[in-house]
């Protein structure tokens, strides 16, 4: 039960996290005009990964896409790449984890296969979360560097007569959304990995039962289950017996009452 709860919670947390990563990637407010200690402008500038926007105090907002690929800073391209990789990995992870959920039964999928899938999705979520956190952090670092550079020459005078307002940018809402979402995806991934350990069938001690058949004797070997938690392993777990007799422990295990929550 605890395993199912952990897996389910991990899935939900990761789902929220990935939705957040997608939202952050699409948001326009990665960097916003710094209003502190600045002249009160009637224009508010903010920028995203894909376009920059200007909101006038009149209420009119104009956004322009970055229609160039080569002309963009390498750091921005890197952030885009990290966020997209995070989304793709997260989406695949979600797909895999849906089939890995203990509360969903697909055909005669064994627990070991579900354990593998849970681990796979968990690792994908962890990497997805790390990609998002890395992307947002790289962008934040870029902002901090640019902020102090523009603060150094806040006003550039032309012969000391004319002043130019230097637009400084600070952290936008998307950065915080990205950090939180990345963290949630990471936590969800860790929960999935923890759930995987519980899903993996432990070595079960079966009662040694023997009977005499004509001509030769067969004994059940205790510990007939061999757990397979190898990443991507396709090994089938079979009970090792040779004969028709069954112990009470060996009654077919699916569908069990524990498979439905």
């Amino acid at each position: 039960m605890a395993v199912t709860a952990c897996q389910g919670l991990g899935f939900v947390v990761s789902l929220i996290g990935i939705a957040g990563i997608i939202a952050a990637t699409c948001m326009d407010q990665w960097s916003t005009q710094d209003l502190y200690n600045n002249p009160v402008t009637a224009v508010f500038n903010y920028q995203g990964l894909w376009r920059s926007c200007v909101r006038e105090s009149s209420g009119f907002t104009e956004c322009r896409g970055y229609f160039t690929l080569l002309g963009l800073p390498a750091m921005l391209q890197a952030v885009r790449a990290l966020m997209i990789v995070g989304i793709v990995l997260g989406a695949i992870g979600l797909l895999v984890s849906i089939f890995a959920l203990k509360c969903i039964r697909i055909g005669s999928m064994e627990d070991s296969a579900k354990a593998n899938m849970t681990l796979t999705s968990g690792i994908m979520f962890i990497v997805s979360g790390l990609c998002a956190i890395a992307g947002v952090s790289v962008f934040a670092n870029m902002l901090v560097t640019n902020f102090w550079m523009s603060t150094a020459n806040m006003y550039t005078g032309m012969g000391g007569m004319v002043q130019t307002v230097q637009t400084r940018y600070t952290f936008g809402a998307a950065l915080f959304v990205g950090w939180v979402a990345g963290g949630l995806t990471l936590i969800g991934g860790v929960m999935m990995c923890i759930a995987c350990r519980g899903l993996a069938p432990e070595e079960t001690n079966y009662k040694a039962v023997s009977y005499h058949a004509s001509g030769h004797s067969v004994a059940y070997k205790p510990g007939g289950f061999k757990a397979s938690t190898g990443f991507g392993s396709n090994t089938k777990n079979k009970k090792i017996y040779d004969g028709g007799a069954r112990t009470e422990d060996e009654v077919q295990s699916y569908p069990s009452k524990h498979d439905y929550v």
């Epitope: 005009q33 002249p39 009160v40 402008t41 009637a42 224009v43 500038n45 920028q47 920059s52 926007c53 200007v54 006038e56 105090s57 009149s58 209420g59 009119f60 104009e62 322009r64 004319v162 002043q163 130019t164 307002v165 637009t167």
Partner: antibody, heavy 118, light 113 residues
Framework: QVQLVESGGGLVKPGGSLRLSCAAS????????MSWIRQAPGKGLEWVAT????????YYLDSVKGRFTISRDNAKNSLYLQMNSLRAEDTAVYYC???????????WGQGTLVTVSS | DIVMTQSPGTLSLSPGERATLSCRSS????????????LTWYQQKPGQAPRLLIY???TRESGIPDRFSGSGSGTDFTLTISRLEPEDFAVYYC?????????FGQGTKLEIK
């Protein structure tokens, strides 16, 4: 068509109060930033105050800050300017205007005269 | 505060002539975010409310004749009336629409010679 009609002007003694109103029609008032601009007799234009969309921000000319208050009632499509502690230098024709692209005042009312005199 | 300086104070011309009105701001009105200059030109006739002519320094308001054109960037701006019509004789104001307070120039009076 767009119409802005100011009212509430008149003669008032120094230190007195007055409330100007601006009735708007012909456009989406609630999603428009609105401003008050004044013009002293024989002088140039002077911006007084602006209220942005959704009551988010209000901006004032330094000389009127603390004395004048801009407000709006979207249900009534009306803009107001509450003027307290009036001075002789506040004597002017007060115009209400809508802000459009480029924060430019694209539509203006006909103006209302405020005279501050003892 | 941004100081807007208009020149000349008065311009005397005849109908059909070309009018060039100048406006200078003490600070740049160019917004780096969209590369637009937040300068506006208005026309005011005696006893009337001002009328918007040009915004973003060079964009003509709808309904404004194409003889009116705006140019300039940063701190220096110009309003040009290519061929003066009798109805163009009025007072012209430029306005900073970039930084509060939204200051106006003192105006240029365009009169018939």
């Amino acid at each position: 068509q767009v119409q802005l009609v100011e009212s509430g002007g008149g003669l008032v003694k120094p230190g007195g109060s007055l409330r100007l109103s601006c009735a708007a029609s012909g456009f989406a008032f609630s999603s428009s930033a609105m401003s008050w601009i004044r013009q002293a007799p024989g002088k140039g234009l002077e911006w007084v105050a602006t209220m942005t969309v959704g009551y988010i921000y209000t901006y004032y000319l330094d000389s009127v800050k603390g004395r004048f208050t801009i407000s709006r009632d979207n249900a009534k499509n009306s803009l107001y300017l509450q003027m307290n502690s009036l001075r002789a230098e506040d004597t002017a024709v007060y115009y209400c205007a809508r802000q459009g692209y480029g924060n430019a005042m694209d539509y203006w009312g006909q103006g209302t005269l405020v005279t501050v005199s003892s | 505060d941004i100081v807007m300086t208009q020149s000349p104070g008065t311009l005397s011309l005849s109908p059909g002539e070309r009018a060039t009105l100048s406006c200078r701001s003490s600070q740049s009105l160019l917004n780096s975010g969209n590369q637009k200059n937040y300068l506006t030109w208005y026309q005011q006739k005696p006893g009337q409310a001002p009328r918007l002519l040009i915004y973003w320094a060079s964009t003509r308001e709808s309904g404004i004749p194409d003889r009116f054109s705006g140019s300039g960037s940063g701190t220096d701006f110009t309003l040009t009336i290519s061929r003066l019509e009798p109805e163009d004789f009025a007072v012209y104001y430029c306005q900073n629409n970039y930084i509060y307070p939204l200051t106006f120039g003192q105006g240029t009076k365009l009169e018939i010679k």
